[in-house]
């Protein structure tokens, strides 16, 4: 079986305050089964940005229809960007586990930084 890879193609994403940012993430395999989550930062203090499985994330939408059984695109859009949103965002695959899912593989991360102000 092909080993799952997490692809985040952009190392750096320049964004504009008030606009929508798109963070790209694709996987190369559907297996092992388990959810994909987005975090800002690393380590125990990382901030959950989006959980495919559950939760309410009013500023986040997915680019693709995650209910497709063959979906491999876990890209997200974050609306109404503010300076507080800057940081490095990681797309992380978990494999199912009991009682807790287990982190399986992380993307390399995309750094979100503020670009020029709109004229």
């Amino acid at each position: 079986e092909e080993e799952l890879q997490m692809i985040q193609p952009e190392k750096l994403l320049l964004v504009t305050v008030g606009k929508t940012a798109t963070l790209h993430c694709t996987v190369t395999s559907l297996l092992p089964v388990g959810p994909v989550l987005w975090f800002r930062g690393v380590g125990p203090g990382r901030e959950l940005i989006y959980n495919q499985k559950e939760g309410h994330f009013p500023r986040v939408t997915t680019v693709s229809d995650l209910t497709k059984r063959n979906n491999m695109d876990f890209s997200i859009r974050i609306s109404s960007i503010t300076p507080a949103d800057v940081g490095t965002y990681y797309c992380v695959k978990f494999r199912k586990g009991s009682p807790e899912n287990v982190e399986f593989k992380s993307g390399p991360g995309t750094e979100m930084a503020l670009g020029a102000k709109p004229s």
Partner: antibody
Framework: DVQLVESGGGVVRPGESLRLSCAAS????????MSWVRQAPGKGLEWLAG????????YYIDSVKGRFTISRDNSKSSLYLRMNSLTAEDTAVYYC???????????WGLGTLVTVSS | ALTQPASVSANPGETVKITCSGG??????YAWYQQKSPGSAPVTVI????ERPSDIPSRFSGSASGSAATLIITGVRVEDEAVYFC???????????FGAGTTLTVL
């Protein structure tokens, strides 16, 4: 409360067609994949078909592929199953079910009975 | 195909375990569905191996390891008498399957 109500069942002759409907309420229908599952008299559950939230992707068990068609109308919060060339083996209670994020089922309708008999 | 025992029985208050085998842990998620009479609407008591819907009593729990899943009813009650179907979703084939059902009798 989540509610799924099937309709369209009845008695048909072998070779005929039928369209089942499932009216959904109590949740954002357009955000959930949906499926049809049936249960023949005295038998277990059998998954038939599933459809993605947007309706673009459909999935079938091999035994009904090409004969059954699953579809949905998100503007009406409705799910459908078109069944062609029915045989006695299609006699069953047909349930619609809402899918979880990982394509299991969390809510079920009450079912509608389809009887195929000459 | 998913395999489960045809029947189990228990006295009220006992712990019941129903096993379901045949799935691949790497690619399969399991669920458990309760049906109190033939042709009545199934009720999901466990999905995603071990997640219990909010309206299901805490005496129902689930687990999965290797190629098997287990439904556990701790302190079984007379009203738990039903047929329990295990179900699986296989991420490799995109197909849902069910076991044949286990009839739980509470003596």
């Amino acid at each position: 409360d989540v509610q799924l109500v099937e309709s369209g069942g009845g008695v048909v002759r072998p070779g005929e067609s039928l369209r089942l409907s499932c009216a959904a309420s109590g949740f954002t229908f357009s955000s959930h994949a949906m499926s049809w599952v049936r249960q023949a008299p005295g038998k277990g559950l059998e998954w038939l078909a599933g459809i993605s939230a947007g309706g673009s992707d459909t999935y079938y068990i091999d035994s009904v592929k090409g004969r059954f068609t699953i579809s949905r109308d998100n503007s009406k919060s409705s799910l459908y199953l078109r069944m062609n060339s029915l045989t006695a083996e299609d006699t069953a209670v047909y349930y619609c079910a809402r899918e979880t994020w990982n394509h299991l089922f969390d809510y079920w309708g009450l079912g509608t009975l389809v009887t195929v008999s000459s | 195909a998913l395999t489960q025992p045809a029947s189990v029985s228990a006295n009220p208050g006992e712990t019941v375990k129903i096993t379901c085998s045949g799935g691949d842990y790497y690619s399969t998620y399991y669920a458990w569905y309760q049906q109190k009479s033939p042709g009545s609407a199934p009720v999901t008591v466990i999905h995603s191996d071990d997640e219990r819907p909010s309206d299901i009593p805490s005496r129902f729990s689930g687990s999965a390891s290797g190629s098997a899943a287990t439904l556990i009813i701790t302190g079984v009650r007379v009203e738990d008498e039903a047929v329990y179907f295990c179900g699986g979703y296989d991420g490799r084939t995109y197909i849902n399957t069910f076991g044949a059902g286990t009839t739980l009798t509470v003596l």
